[in-house]
């Protein structure tokens, strides 16, 4: 569907041209669709003298005034002016209403049935205004930060929202710092989260017609300084043919800024280790974690001399970690031969 066709699917109130001055009462959270002229030649909408942009939560677009979810600040005077002139096609005042009721659920929302010039809407059970945003269930947040839960909904009468934690009514009275609620934004905010804030948070949205609920699973990550953590199994033992390219991967996790080196173990005077007990190594690559592709070691056009042990060494202000892997290089003429390589080593 094109956007224009999609909008056509929405009920759109089209105030009559005979009644230029109108007053509409709209419930908080209610979506608004108002027409002005035909879609292809629709007028321009203005709020309090300022023209509405074609994008955003409140927008004037193809002759339509669209408000995704009516908020108190949306109340006011709206004008629709004909394109290319200053002729007023619509002169509307939107008023915030607590709730809207209708005596007839089956009435066409496009028809004008209220002699007082106020529009009412059919009753409707609560629904999520953006259901596509309510799919990710589990959220991990570092301790000390702030979490905002939101469950924007609409319905008629305007639904109410309440919150549960682990199935129990949640008012935050036992939480240091408490909680902050914004019913008009369908939100709950918890500042400076701590591990005891972990749990399942449920928003329960209900009105006289029905109810809906959504669960957020919150995990709070405690951070304690530690030496870098290297992903198990990386770098991996690799077998390659002479002349081919090889990539060795090392995945590093670190709270403090890490420094990474790629080392190749070498033999000097027939020995792999020095008098101090440390292995002889050649530094192939060194950088901090912000450098592009530092966690990958590229070996181009490998030869037999490239075979051997490679180590990814990561350090930060707390300590060092390293893991090693073996590269086996096969001659071109015998690509099916494989050798048993020692297992990758991990030292923390």
């Amino acid at each position: 569907l094109e956007a224009s066709e999609e909008v056509e699917l929405e009920p759109c109130l089209a105030p009559s041209l005979e009644q230029q001055e109108q007053e509409l009462t709209v419930a908080l959270g209610q979506p608004v669709r108002l027409c002005c002229g035909r879609a292809e030649r629709g007028g321009h909408w203005y709020k309090e003298g300022s023209r509405l942009a074609p994008a955003g939560r409140v927008r004037g677009w193809r002759g339509r005034l669209e408000i995704a979810s009516f908020l108190p600040e949306d109340a006011g005077r709206y004008l629709c002016l004909a394109r290319g002139s200053m002729i007023v096609l619509q002169n509307l005042t939107l008023i915030t209403g607590d709730s809207l009721t209708s005596s007839n659920d089956d009435e066409d929302p496009k028809s004008h049935r209220d002699p007082s010039n106020r529009h009412s809407y059919p009753q409707q059970a609560p629904y999520w205004t953006h259901p596509q945003r309510m799919e990710k269930k589990l959220h991990a947040v570092p301790a000390g930060n702030t979490v905002k839960f939101r469950c924007p909904a609409a319905g008629n009468p305007t639904p109410t929202i309440r919150w549960l934690k682990d199935g129990q009514a949640f008012h935050g009275e036992n939480r240091i710092g408490g909680i902050r609620l914004r019913h008009q934004h369908w939100s709950l905010v918890m500042e400076s989260v701590v591990p005891s804030d972990r749990g399942t948070y449920t928003c329960l949205v209900e009105n006289a017609v029905g109810s809906i609920r959504y669960n957020y699973l919150l995990d709070v990550l405690e951070r304690s300084p530690h030496r870098p953590i290297l992903q198990a199994g990386l770098p991996a033992n690799t077998t390659a043919v002479v002349g081919s390219d090889v990539e060795l991967l090392c995945k590093v996790y670190s709270d403090a800024q890490p420094h990474i080196q790629w080392l190749k173990h070498i033999v000097i005077n027939g020995s792999s280790f020095g008098a101090d007990g440390f292995p002889y190594v050649q530094v192939l690559k060194t950088a901090d974690i912000n450098s592009s592709e530092v966690e990958v070691l590229y070996l181009r056009n490998v030869s037999a001399e490239d075979a051997g042990e490679y180590t990814c060494l990561a350090g930060n202000s707390i300590g060092l970690s390293y893991q090693s892997a073996w590269l086996t290089v096969l001659p071109e003429e015998d690509p099916t031969w494989t050798a048993a390589a020692p297992e990758a080593r991990y030292t923390d």
């Epitope: 994008a55 945003r133 839960f149 469950c151 951070r223």
Partner: antibody
Framework: EVQLVESGGGLVQPGGSLRLSCAAS????????ISWVRQAPGKGLEWVGR????????NYADSVKGRFTISADTSKNTAYLQMNSLRAEDTAVYYC????????????????????WGQGTLVTVSS | DIQMTQSPSSLSASVGDRVTITCRAS??????LAWYKQKPGKAPKLLIY???FLYSGVPSRFSGSGSGTDFTLTISSLQPEDFATYYC?????????FGQGTKVEIK
Amino acid sequence: EVQLVESGGGLVQPGGSLRLSCAASGFTFTSTGISWVRQAPGKGLEWVGRTHLGDGSTNYADSVKGRFTISADTSKNTAYLQMNSLRAEDTAVYYCARTYGIYDLYVDYTEYVMDYWGQGTLVTVSS
Amino acid sequence: DIQMTQSPSSLSASVGDRVTITCRASQDVDTSLAWYKQKPGKAPKLLIYSASFLYSGVPSRFSGSGSGTDFTLTISSLQPEDFATYYCQQSTGHPQTFGQGTKVEIK
């Protein structure tokens, strides 16, 4: 009490380098972040960049990308702003600010808020 | 970049006045907007986050509202210590951007 103290400002020639420090105390250093914001004389605030002290990730304004580097030493509770290839337009008071995330789980993004600021340090780039 | 435009750029008011400052974003920033107060020669101070949440320790005469592109900071009854420059700042887009500031002066 949360405190941030900047140091390292001064006069430097165009093309030169300077490293600013931001010593922090009174909060768990690795759980939040540090932002750098600057203010040219008589002008408004301009965000320079931010580091998340937990994972070391950094973000920069386009105007300083490739020239400025933000880093941190968690053992010293200190963040740094390394400024290279300085230009006259980099002249400003530089503030560091503790930055925490508001994790909006509905839209799955993080709003970054700067709640504690240092006193600022003046950097003058002039020949 | 998302442009933040504050209005007015300056205003004169008296103690006890109700003051309203507006901030408009060049594109939708949802509720990802903060307000800061700065006195001459001092660092900024956080007043409001997420468009309408009062930061702890900030007097209740300050309030924020709005979402999408249009936001408002209101001081219900101006006090002597409120004469300062106020900045809005969005952080939903990269980079974070500030408004140009609104200077509140004594009438």
